[in-house]
């Protein structure tokens, strides 16, 4: 092909290529062209004759203006067309009548400000209609009942100010599952006008200047609908009342989307009408105050969005926004529930009370004083089979005793990004009896004592990243109750001291991240007693993170238990010179990371074993020494193997001999050094 | 199932030093720490120390600390308890013990070694 | 070093009585506390651990509670085979010592 269209299974993809007409010289047999993005200005239906197969074919941001009806007599097979961004202004009926096998047609973003006559008549297959930006005026799409498979109108960011059945009642035998009319400027609904589509599921009003009374209005011509999911975000709904969605009692809503709103007063029975829905939008509003029948009569909605609905209005303590107690007792099917970003003053002892089906809640930086957690902080829980709990970004100082006990089915438990500072006891966790996974990084410090996880011997997944982590020393290990244990993350605590038993019974450990501590003292051969194998046993680890600790040595045994071992991570410590057999056992590494150490010299019967298998090797920024005995073996294994080895070009470079300075690692020529050969 | 069969009893002499062995079954040996606790007749159960099976390392309680050393035999999954310089006080049921998988609990205890202090 | 203080020493009962003994800390031991049952010439057996939990196989008639420093045993309704002696023992910090223990005898 002369023109630079790259072709793959039978998808040619012609985009970007600054095309003034359309390629004559790709494989007759391809089934999708994209010819997006180019400089089009019309499709002669003549270039498509020798594309006959197509099914897709996107033009898109051109500047087509007029379209051949002949183009679709050339492309019978013809499901998907996309005119999207050019500039059709008119639809004549011939335009699209040979497109009969059409389900989708994207016309978005054109120039369209009315639709004469039935331009879409033939489409009986069509299931998206995409009208969005343009400048229709109307929902006129036709003067006779057709488009009877559409599932998707989309007319969003058009000039609509009214829905009138007459308009809409070509879709008399048509179900509808997405009508969007978002950012349209509507003021009216007309009576009948949604009953005049033969089922209608899904409305999206998002971006329309509603406001409650117009809501109600919407809501009314809704009853006796099929309608299942309504989208009303940023449509200027203030306040709600036990009348505002009164309409919706005669249909069986499951999706309600009132996000971007507001909202400031949630009326007792507001939905009180709608016992069929499921999945509640309520994000970023502005209520005030939560009453104890708001939310009355939502007894089967499983998700509820209330992120960032509580704001307070001022500095003022006064001004803080209020949830009654009781308030979410009616939602007896709520599954998932998010209050992540709130100003709300506090738990109060029945604020959950009645979630007898609540698996998630996040309450990431919800509260403005909940510095605390006592034994009275999540009673009203007791009753929930909570299994994932966000506490995140709370500003929490303390954990008491018995904080956790009435969670009992919680197994994810998030007290990370706090300012916890404090020995744990492990009263803690009392009560956590199916427990797997603690995450308690970045907060000011933890003291560890033998008991702080004895309660919690089901425990997978603990994180302690940087948290001053105080006593992790003692023996027995804190860490000795968790036989369970996969993954342990204590970095960034500036440990210096721990004993060879800290990990000990650890058996099923397959992730330990220990970066950016103060380890090398105890791989020293002078440390006092000898160096310390706190990995000894570790038979099933999988990733190791050791970057970032001063390691200047490493005893040779020090990985000898660590059969599994997938990946290493050495990086950014003072690694000279390691032991002959260091990486004997490592038979499974993937992945060896000893960036930025002050490795000289990789030899064949240190390095050998570890680079068998590697798929990925980083040893950017190191002193290489590029003479023979160094450097050899290395240089012959680089320019053989399959192993990725990122910025090979430019961050391996020699450092001595003087002569060598700055040059390149991999194109040292080893053809006058003898017994180099990388594989035997 | 998870046994801890002691040895026999003992009678020694003041001054002397007796070795009360405590051998494991049921699980891994290595896995668990041993404890030591006695209880001299009508009296409370006193807690004398830990091992580590897995490397020996020790925890005493300071009131015996000169006197008692306890070791183990991990070929032979056995814990021992020696106790120097007997006086007639020292006269007790010797106990060992075996943490739960809840590690703040004795859930697993030997049948006891009666060492008899006496002239 | 934390001392555990048991009272009553002993107690006399009868079958089908209400029993409680209390255990007493020097210090916080965080609810770390076990009940001990021993009868004459045995091995001590757990009764319950972290004050409060029922260890397995031991009839729901034993309970734990407390917190802190002040803890209790109670044996709801007693049965002849629950004559015996009672230990508290904490398990905060070493050394984990013992109550002088209760001896519930017969009335």
């Known amino acids: 092909s002369t023109t630079k269209c790259t072709v793959s299974h039978e998808v040619a993809d012609c985009s970007h290529l600054k095309l003034t007409q359309v390629p004559d010289d790709l494989p007759t047999n391809i089934t999708v062209l994209n010819l997006t993005h180019n400089q089009l200005r019309r499709l002669p239906a003549a270039n498509f004759t020798r594309y006959s197969q197509l099914t897709s074919l996107d033009v898109g941001f051109n500047t087509i203006s007029k379209l051949e009806p002949e183009l679709c007599q050339k492309l019978p097979m013809l499901k998907v067309l996309n005119l999207q961004h050019n500039e059709l202004s008119q639809l004549s009926d011939k335009t699209f009548a040979f497109c009969t096998n059409l389900t989708e047609l994207h016309l978005m973003s054109n120039s369209i400000q009315k639709i004469k006559n039935n331009p879409f008549v033939k489409q009986k297959n069509l299931i998206t209609l995409d009208l969005s930006h343009n400048g229709l005026s109307s929902t006129k799409l036709g003067t006779q009942v057709q488009l009877e498979n559409l599932q998707e109108l989309l007319l969003s960011n058009n000039k609509i100010q009214a829905l009138k059945s007459e308009e809409l009642d070509i879709f008399a035998n048509s179900s509808l599952k997405k009508l969007e009319l978002s950012s349209n400027q509507i003021k009216e609904f007309s009576p009948g006008c949604f009953h005049a589509i033969g089922r209608l599921f899904g409305l999206f009003l998002n971006n329309v200047q509603l406001g409650p009374s117009l809501t109600e209005k919407l809501c009314l011509e809704l009853a006796n609908t099929s309608i299942r999911n309504l989208s009303l975000s940023n449509s200027q709904l203030s306040t709600t009342s036990n009348t505002t969605f009164l309409g919706l009692k005669w249909t069986n809503l499951t999706m309600l989307d009132l996000s971007y709103n507001n909202l400031n007063v949630v009326g007792n029975d507001s939905f009180a009408w709608l016992p069929q829905l499921e999945y509640f939008f309520l994000e970023y509003n502005n209520i005030q105050h939560l009453f104890s029948h708001s939310l009355h009569g939502l007894f089967n909605v499983r998700y509820l969005n209330l992120k960032r609905s509580f704001t307070k209005q001022s500095i003022s303590l006064a001004s803080l926004p209020k949830i009654d107690d009781f308030s979410f007792q009616w939602l007896k099917c709520l599954e998932h529930l998010n209050m992540e970003d709130n100003d709300i003053p506090g738990i109060k002892s029945n604020m959950f009370t009645g979630l007898i089906n609540l698996k998630y809640l996040s309450l990431s930086n919800s509260f403005t004083s909940l510095r605390t957690l006592t034994n009275e902080t999540f009673v009203s829980l007791a009753h929930s089979p909570l299994h994932i709990l966000n506490l995140t970004k709370n500003k929490i100082s303390k954990i008491e005793s018995d904080a956790f006990s009435w969670l009992g089915h919680l197994e994810v438990l998030d007290l990370g990004l706090n300012e916890i500072g404090q020995e744990l006891t492990g009263q803690e966790w009392r009560g956590l009896e199916n427990i797997f996974e603690i995450y308690l990084s970045y907060n000011k410090y933890l003291q560890l004592t033998r008991n702080s996880f004895a309660l919690v011997p089901s425990l997978q997944r603990l994180m302690l990243r940087r948290v001053a982590l105080k006593n992790v020393d003692s023996s027995p290990s804190p860490f000795q109750p968790l036989r369970n244990l996969t993954i342990l993350d204590l970095s960034n605590n500036n440990i210096a001291n721990i004993n060879d038993d800290m990990l000990e019974g650890l058996e099923k450990l397959e992730i330990l991240d220990l970066q950016h501590n103060n380890l090398a003292r105890l791989w020293k051969h002078a440390n006092p007693g000898g160096p310390i194998y706190f990995l000894k046993g570790l038979s099933h680890l999988h990733i190791l993170n050791l970057e970032s600790n001063g390691f200047d040595e490493i005893p040779v045994e020090v990985f000898k238990d660590l059969f599994e071992l997938k990946i290493i991570d050495l990086g950014l410590n003072n690694l000279n010179t390691l032991p002959a057999s260091v990486f004997n056992n490592q038979v499974s590494l993937k992945s060896l990371n000893l960036q930025k150490n002050l490795i000289t010299s990789v030899e064949k019967k240190v390095f050998g074993p570890a680079f068998r298998n590697l798929t990925e090797l980083d040893m950017r920024f190191n002193p290489f020494d590029c003479t023979c005995e160094s450097i050899a073996w290395f240089v012959n294994w680089i320019n053989e193997t399959h192993t990725n080895i990122p910025e090979l070009s430019s961050h391996y470079l020699c450092n001595t001999p003087p002569h060598y300075h700055g040059f390149p690692v991999r194109l040292f020529d080893t053809s006058s050094c003898k017994d180099s050969a990388p594989f035997e | 199932q998870v046994q801890l069969v002691q040895s026999g009893a003992e009678v020694k002499k003041p001054g002397a030093s007796v070795k009360v062995s405590c051998k494991a079954s049921?699980?891994?040996?290595?896995?668990?720490?041993i404890h030591w606790v006695r209880q001299a007749p009508g009296q409370r159960l006193e807690w004398m120390g830990e091992i580590n099976p897995n490397n020996g390392r020790i925890n005493y309680n300071e009131k015996f600390k000169t006197r008692v050393t306890i070791t183990r035999d991990t070929s032979a999954s056995t814990a021992y308890m020696e106790l120097s310089s007997l006086r007639s006080e020292d006269t007790a049921v010797y106990y060992c013990?075996?943490?739960?998988?809840?590690?703040?609990?004795?859930?697993?205890w030997g049948q006891g070694t009666l060492v008899t202090v006496s002239s | 070093d934390i001392q555990m203080t048991q009272s009553p020493s002993s107690l006399s009962a009868s079958v089908g009585d209400r029993v409680t003994i209390t255990c007493r800390a020097s210090g916080n031991i965080h609810n770390y506390l076990a009940w001990y049952q021993q009868k004459p010439g045995k091995a001590p057996k757990l009764l319950i651990y972290?004050?409060?939990t029922l260890a397995d196989g031991v009839p729901s008639r034993f309970s734990g509670s407390g917190s802190g420093t002040d803890f209790t045993l109670t044996i709801s309704s007693l049965q002849p085979e629950d004559f015996a002696t009672y230990y508290c023992?904490?398990?905060?910090?070493?050394?984990?010592?013992f109550g002088q223990g209760t001896k519930l005898e017969i009335k």
């Open positions: 013990a075996r943490v739960g998988v809840i590690i703040t609990t004795f859930p697993y």
């Open positions: 049921g699980y891994t040996f290595t896995t668990y720490w």
């Open positions: 023992q904490h398990f905060w910090s070493t050394p984990f010592t």
């Open positions: 972290n004050a409060k």
